[in-house]
């Protein structure tokens, strides 16, 4: 028997993916485990194999269908189970009644691009990926800019309180290399969390024009 503290956390990307992490102190490393999803009002069910991500935690992605298909609604409840093989039988290690739209984590924004760059400012746009049409415009974004000599953790967060898929960065230093990231979160959901940060976009401000001699 496996003893210890167990934690089973899952998020829905709002379309066709449920990502789960299961951690268990004292779990057996060579045990085969999986996550099983059983919606209360759908004809399908889905399974994924838990793969180790650290000493005592495993992760897997339940792929429910085509990436942009709306596989679950706000009314669905999905029973999620962690099953581990014990000899010839499967043992239930963890179970939860999962409300997908209370546990959202969207995909990271994609297609970041510099729309326009000047000496002191830069306009950047992006797109959201695999986000449900349910949200309409009720999303918020956080962005951060990496300046030379600083870390991402030191970068101040800029908050966009509406679905605005662009930003104009001001007060930049001329002829300087920067990096930019953005993440997204729906307003919906008690346990909803921020998406992962986007891939960083590197850009360089234009050099200042040389002043004329007087």
């Amino acid at each position: 028997a496996v003893n210890g503290t167990s934690q089973f956390t899952c998020f829905y990307n709002s379309r066709a993916n449920i990502s789960c992490v299961w951690s268990q102190d004292g779990a057996l490393q060579d045990t085969s485990c999986q996550v099983h999803a059983w919606p209360d009002r759908r004809r399908w069910n889905q399974t994924c194999e838990l793969l180790p991500v650290s000493q005592a935690s495993w992760a897997c992605n339940l792929i429910l269908g085509a990436p942009d298909s709306q596989k679950l609604t706000t009314v669905d409840i999905v029973t999620l189970r962690v099953l581990c093989r014990e000899g010839v039988r499967w043992r239930v290690m963890a179970i939860q009644d999962f409300k997908p739209f209370e546990n959202l984590r969207l995909m990271a924004p994609i297609s970041l691009q510099v729309v326009h760059v000047e000496t002191h400012r830069c306009n950047i746009s992006w797109e959201i990926s695999q986000a449900s049409h349910y949200f309409e415009r009720h999303l918020e974004f956080e962005a951060r800019t990496l300046s030379p000599g600083h870390t991402w953790e030191e970068a101040p967060l800029l908050t966009l309180k509406q679905k605005q898929e662009w930003i104009c960065l001001e007060t930049l230093t001329p002829d300087t290399q920067y990096e930019f990231q953005v993440r997204v979160k729906p307003l919906q959901g008690e346990f909803t969390t921020w998406s992962p940060w986007s891939q960083p976009l590197a850009f360089r401000t234009k050099p200042a024009a040389l002043g004329k001699d007087t």
Partner: antibody
Framework: EVQLVQSGAEVKKPGATVKISCKVS????????IHWVQQAPGKGLEWMGW????????EYAPGFQDRVTITADTSTDTAYMELSSLRSEDTAVYYC??????????WGQGTTVTVSS | EIVMTQSPATLSVSPGERATLSCRAS??????LHWYQQKPGQAPRLLII???QSISGIPARFSGSRSGTEFTLTISSLQSEDFAVYYC?????????FGQGTKLEIK
């Protein structure tokens, strides 16, 4: 500009069926949810259900499930709500509305249905 | 289903004063609570979502708050156009349900 324009008032006999239309403009109908809400004099606002035009799914409130049918015609950007086996307590104003599943951002002007023998 | 209870049924307030409307859920609904305003002969209009998030285009005098299962809509300084019926609505458990409304009238 987002608009939802509903069909006109109806007078029906008990046991009959009523079908109300909701013509929308100003947004992508094919990617939207259209909801129907009943506002009866003594009962207040009651959610009847919705149609998800992208997923092609409907969701009905248990209190209306047996008698209501919500449909959509994406070629004309029009949603329909049909309520059958009418009784006097179905006398109400019926609203179509657009929103995500959780709340209603834009509403039609309402259609009054009177059920009387 | 979840029962939403609004109080008071009628609230009489003078223009320029503050109005506080209450909505209580029969069970925990997290922040899945939304507020609407309805004037006579008109459809309801969405004001506040998720307990406290204002909808764009709604005047800043409208604000929402939450304490457990009790939600409050506050109108900081009443204007003549604010006298109407206000409804709360939960979206935690299907079917979504509305409160019976609070009528805000001129004192």
């Amino acid at each position: 500009e987002v608009q939802l324009v509903q069909s006109g008032a109806e007078v029906k006999k008990p046991g009959a069926t009523v079908k109300i239309s909701c013509k929308v403009s100003g947004f992508n109908f094919k990617e939207s949810l259209i909801h129907w809400v009943q506002q009866a004099p003594g009962k207040g606002l009651e959610w009847m259900g919705w149609i998800d035009n992208e997923a092609g799914e409907t969701e009905y409130a248990p209190g209306f499930q047996d008698r209501v049918t919500i449909t959509a015609d994406t070629s004309t950007d029009t949603a329909y709500m049909e309520l059958s086996s009418l009784r006097s307590e179905d006398t109400a104003v019926y609203y179509c509305a657009r929103g995500g599943p959780w709340f209603l951002s834009y509403w039609g002007q309402g259609t009054t249905v009177t059920v009387s023998s | 289903e979840i029962v939403m209870t609004q109080s008071p049924a009628t609230l009489s307030v003078s223009p320029g004063e503050r109005a506080t409307l209450s909505c209580r859920a029969s069970q925990i609904i997290s922040n899945n609570l939304h507020w609407y305003q309805q004037k006579p002969g008109q459809a309801p209009r969405l004001l506040i979502i998720y307990g406290l998030q204002s909808i764009s285009g709604i005047p800043a005098r409208f604000s929402g708050s939450r304490s457990g299962t009790e939600f409050t809509l506050t109108i900081s300084s009443l204007q003549s156009e604010d006298f109407a019926v206000y409804y709360c609505q939960q979206s935690n458990n299907w079917p979504w349900t509305f409160g019976q409304g609070t009528k805000l009238e001129i004192k």
